[in-house]
Structure formats: C-alpha cells, structure tokens
C-alpha cells in the first residue's frame, strides 16, 4: 500500500529536491528558500528566482522551505524553571534547558519542567543524574525509596509498598510493642 500523502507533499514530490511546484502553475518548479528566510513571492517562471526574504526579529526558519511566514521563536518557560541556553536566530529556534544539578521531566512532547537532582541522602547513587533523568538511588538498610528519596522505615505503614523492603524493621517494631504489653 502506498502511504497517503498530503497535498503539499504530493506537490513537492513532482519537483526535484530543493524545489517545489508553483501553486498556480504545476509545470513550474521554484527553488525553495534557504533556512533563515521565507517565501515572499513564488518564482515567476522556470529558471527564475524565488523571492525569499529574511525572517524578522523574533522569528526563524530552521530548514529550506516555502513558508509564507517565519515561525515564532519559542520562549523559555520561567514557571517551569527553564533557562535560555541559546537565543533565537533567524535560522534556529531558542534552546531552553535547566540549571546545573537539575534534570528535565517531559510532561508532554513539547513541555518540560526542571527539577533538582536527588542527592541520595541515606542511600547511594546507583545512576548519576542526567539531562532527562533524575539520579537513581539505592537506599541503605532501614530506608525505602519514596518519591526518589530514601525515607526511614519508621515511616512505613503496612498499606504502602514499602512493607516488603521494611518487613524486618516492621516485625521488630511489632515485636518490641508486643513485648512491652506483657
């Protein structure tokens, strides 16, 4: 089966690479605009230049194109802890990231939030913090992992998942309680 192509892809596939089919005359292939520019006017005829203009401040195109408008530059989202790694240029969007000792958590494909890397107090670093992943901690005996922090087994309630990890401690606590009642 041939995959369904959108109108624009269909039109482009008729022309060689780096060119697109004239929207009013499908016998003409116009040269695409370079990155950092956008299409102001289609080429008037075969072998004639496409009228491309440079993107204005605050906008960009990152690849060759025949867009009628440049794309708006992204803004780093301060409320998500994001910082600007590199500013927008005519041919590259803003690059946002996190501060040192932080990692990105993606809530969706195009939204991330910065969080502090876990320090693994009362545990050891199993895997170091990376750009898109928090530190992986292994907890010392008598501690269990909750929300990526090593928490004392004295905070483990029987209904929680920690019971398996903390079972000896729970039994001990129960034992001392029982012995105190005699």
């Amino acid at each position: 089966l041939v995959p369904h192509l959108g109108d624009r892809e269909k039109r482009d596939s008729v022309c060689p690479q780096g060119k697109y089919i004239h929207p009013q005359n499908n016998s003409i292939c116009c040269t695409k605009c370079h990155k950092g520019t956008y299409l102001y006017n289609d080429c008037p005829g075969p072998g004639q230049d496409t009228d491309c203009r440079e993107c204005e401040s605050g906008s960009f195109t990152a690849s060759e194109n025949h867009l009628r408008h440049c794309l708006s530059c992204s803004k780093c989202r301060k409320e998500m802890g994001q910082v600007e790694i590199s500013s927008c240029t005519v041919d590259r969007d803003t690059v946002c990231g996190c501060r040192k000792n932080q990692y990105r958590h993606y809530w969706s494909e195009n939204l991330f939030q910065c969080f502090n890397c876990s320090l693994c107090l009362n545990g050891t670093v199993h895997l170091s913090c990376q750009e898109k992943q928090n530190t992986v901690c292994t907890c010392h005996a008598g501690f269990f992992l909750r929300e990526n922090e090593c928490v004392s087994c004295s905070n483990c309630k029987k209904s929680l998942e920690c019971t398996k990890l903390c079972l000896p401690q729970i039994e001990n606590v129960k034992g001392t309680e029982d012995s105190g009642t005699t």
């Epitope: 409320e79 969080f115 928090n134 929300e147």
Partner: nanobody, 119 residues
C-alpha cells in the same frame, strides 16, 4: 490544608461547550502556577494546560490549542477552563492541580469533574 474543588463537568454533544471551575483554598493562590490535567477512561494523565500566577502566556497541549482557554481570578481564588468545539476524544475526568515543585508528581490535585462528549 490545600483544597481544590472542580465543578462544571457534564454530558455535552460534540461541537458543544463547557466551562470548568476549580475553587482553591489553603494556600496563596495568587502565587502559584495552576494546571489542568485530564484522564480519559483506561488512559494515563494528560497535561491539558497551565497558567502562571500573573495569568500571562498560558500553555496549551497541541490537542486542545485553539479550542480551550485557561484563565484565573486571583481575587476569587478560582481557576477556569473554557472548553469549546468539544470532541469525543475530550471525554475524561478533568483535575486541577498545583504545579509540582519537588518532583514529577502531583502533591495537590482535586478529585476531578467528569466531562463526557457524545458524538
């Protein structure tokens, strides 16, 4: 004690509109970024929209962009979600939440309000 109480859900036909509200208490609402998330039947949580404390430059998931509008009234400690041109795929329980601070989980979020869109 933080409390978030959603309302405004219901049954609506495809193409229709609903306005969800979230009444907040127990914290300084005007200082917090607020979030709408949703959970469709049998699916995981999806981030719908969020709005910073000053109400400027809200974020929308691609799936709702141009159809949903988030807003807030800091004097009433209330968050809103205006939902227009509703689709069957918008059917979900909608929760309002405080933007997480310590890690990628929701410490504070409401019980939710069910939105059902019939096609």
């Amino acid at each position: 004690e933080v409390q978030l109480l959603e309302s405004g859900g219901g049954l609506v036909q495809a193409g229709g509109s609903l306005r969800l509200s979230c009444a907040a208490s127990g914290f300084t609402f005007a200082h917090e970024t607020m979030v709408w998330v949703r959970q469709a039947p049998g699916k995981g949580l999806e981030w719908v929209s969020h709005i910073p404390p000053d109400g400027q430059d809200p974020f929308y998931a691609d799936s709702v962009k141009g159809r949903f509008t988030i807003s807030r009234d800091n004097s009433k400690n209330t968050l809103y979600l205006q939902m227009n041109s509703l689709r069957a795929e918008d059917t979900a329980v909608y929760h309002c939440a405080l933007l997480p601070k310590r890690g990628p989980w929701f410490d504070y979020w409401g019980q939710g309000t069910l939105v059902t869109v019939s096609s």
